[in-house]
Amino acid sequence: FGISGKHFITVTTFTSAGNIGEDGTLSCTFEPDIKLNGIVIQWLKEGIKGLVHEFKEGKDDLSQQHEMFRGRTAVFADQVVVGNASLRLKNVQLTDAGTYTCYIHTSKGKGNANLEYKTGAFSMPEINVDYNASSESLRCEAPRWFPQPTVAWASQVDQGANFSEVSNTSFELNSENVTMKVVSVLYNVTINNTYSCMIENDIAKATGDIKVTDSEVKRRSQLELLNSG
């Protein structure tokens, strides 16, 4: 390694969020080094003895891996030489939340960076016209959220209006007793208007839009993670 111990390399991480029960990615990049065998990647988690993951000499080394991560982690091995040290995490759990350190040692030097990993549940909302209701109403449903989000309605025509008096929101615990199904109904809607259902917690914000006219119904949904770094 020669002078590697005397030089610092730039390591960059991004605060990210994991959707429980799905794959997650802990993002980390570093100054590339074409000598794959000289690259060591170590992922650590605050409060955990042992490693989250280690990759060295071109392959994974799980000899010091903590049991809670056994069989749940992998680096993108073919992207390590171009400076990608991101970690793939299987079946994200609430307990995976915390502060992680991405530590890199290459022939050019060494460096590290921390990232805050948040875990929860978030999903796209779907808005439909509720024809069962006595008056025309809209039903906004999203299958998985945690922690409990806030739900707000907005309308293109009545901008700034408060719809809390004419809407009803419920949170139904899903079968695994962690995440919840969000259902919100907006009453007394008018046609030729666009309505938005906004669901938000400290991890994600999702919006569902619906445009109702005499001839058609148009829908659109989007989801954004509320990253702080």
Partner: antibody, heavy 121, light 107 residues
Framework: QVQLQQSGAELVRPGTSVKMSCKAS????????IGWAKQRPGHGFEWIGD????????NYNEKFKGKATLTADKSSSTAYMQFSSLTSEDSAIYYC??????????????WGQGTSITVSS | DIQMTQSPSSLSASLGGKVTITCKAS??????VAWYQHKPGQCPRLLIH???TLQPGIPARFSGSGSGRDYSFSISNLEPEDSATYFC?????????FGGGTKLEIK
């Protein structure tokens, strides 16, 4: 391409043990978990357990703890499963399979051809 | 331990038709469900993983969907070579679990 070659069929006596092998080729043996499954006619598949040859780490289905022992030999890229105290209930086809995703335990993406074990006196 | 209840156990369908098989997990939730095709004398073949991701080389006639505890697998435009046993695998937890299998016959 990824290949898993399993040892041949065996006829064994009740109460004895049998050790079957699964030789891997076409990928880095130490970097992927290898899983084992049991198939009996009319019973579908049952998960036995898996092993990470890179460190010898194992996971077992509680039902097969004490019955199955999983090992791996890095030098020959071969995984082994020993079954002990055999009874007629152990008569089945046993499959080994590579778990996709490297150190991440994924789905069973490449399978061996199976080893048929018949337990009979 | 998680159990995967697969249904139906057998079905018969016409050439060119469509079939759907379901697997229900006894508990938990995650997207780690795979679907396999198994023909007599052959080793099982992975068709779909992570609920809906098609393996390379598998035709788009095969599809998967689901969330929570309920997962489904469909084959459309059925062909004679689709006659086989199909089964699901839950691989999200430490202990993996198989569905009981569905034997498909093409008429």
């Amino acid at each position: 391409q990824v290949q898993l070659q399993q040892s041949g069929a065996e006829l064994v006596r009740p109460g004895t043990s049998v050790k079957m092998s699964c030789k891997a080729s076409g990928y880095t043996f130490t970097s992927y978990w290898i899983g084992w499954a049991k198939q009996r006619p009319g019973h579908g598949f049952e998960w036995i357990g898996d092993i990470y040859p890179g460190g010898g780490y194992t996971n077992y289905n509680e039902k097969f703890k004490g019955k199955a022992t999983l090992t791996a030999d890095k030098s020959s890229s071969t995984a082994y499963m020993q079954f002990s105290s055999l009874t007629s209930e152990d008569s089945a086809i046993y499959y080994c399979a590579r778990l996709d995703g490297s150190s991440y335990r994924g789905a069973m993406d490449s399978w061996g051809q199976g080893t048929s074990i018949t337990v009979s006196s | 331990d998680i159990q995967m209840t697969q249904s139906p156990s057998s079905l018969s369908a016409s050439l060119g038709g469509k079939v759907t098989i379901t697997c229900k997990a006894s508990q938990g939730f995650n997207k780690y469900v795979a679907w396999y095709q198994h023909k007599p004398g052959q080793c099982p073949r992975l068709l779909i993983h992570y609920t809906s991701t098609l393996q390379p080389g598998i035709p788009a006639r095969f599809s998967g969907s689901g969330s929570g505890r309920d997962y489904s697998f469909s084959i459309s435009n059925l062909e004679p070579e689709d006659s086989a046993t199909y089964f699901c695998l839950q691989y999200g937890n430490l202990l993996y679990a198989f569905g009981g299998g569905t034997k498909l016959e093409i008429k």
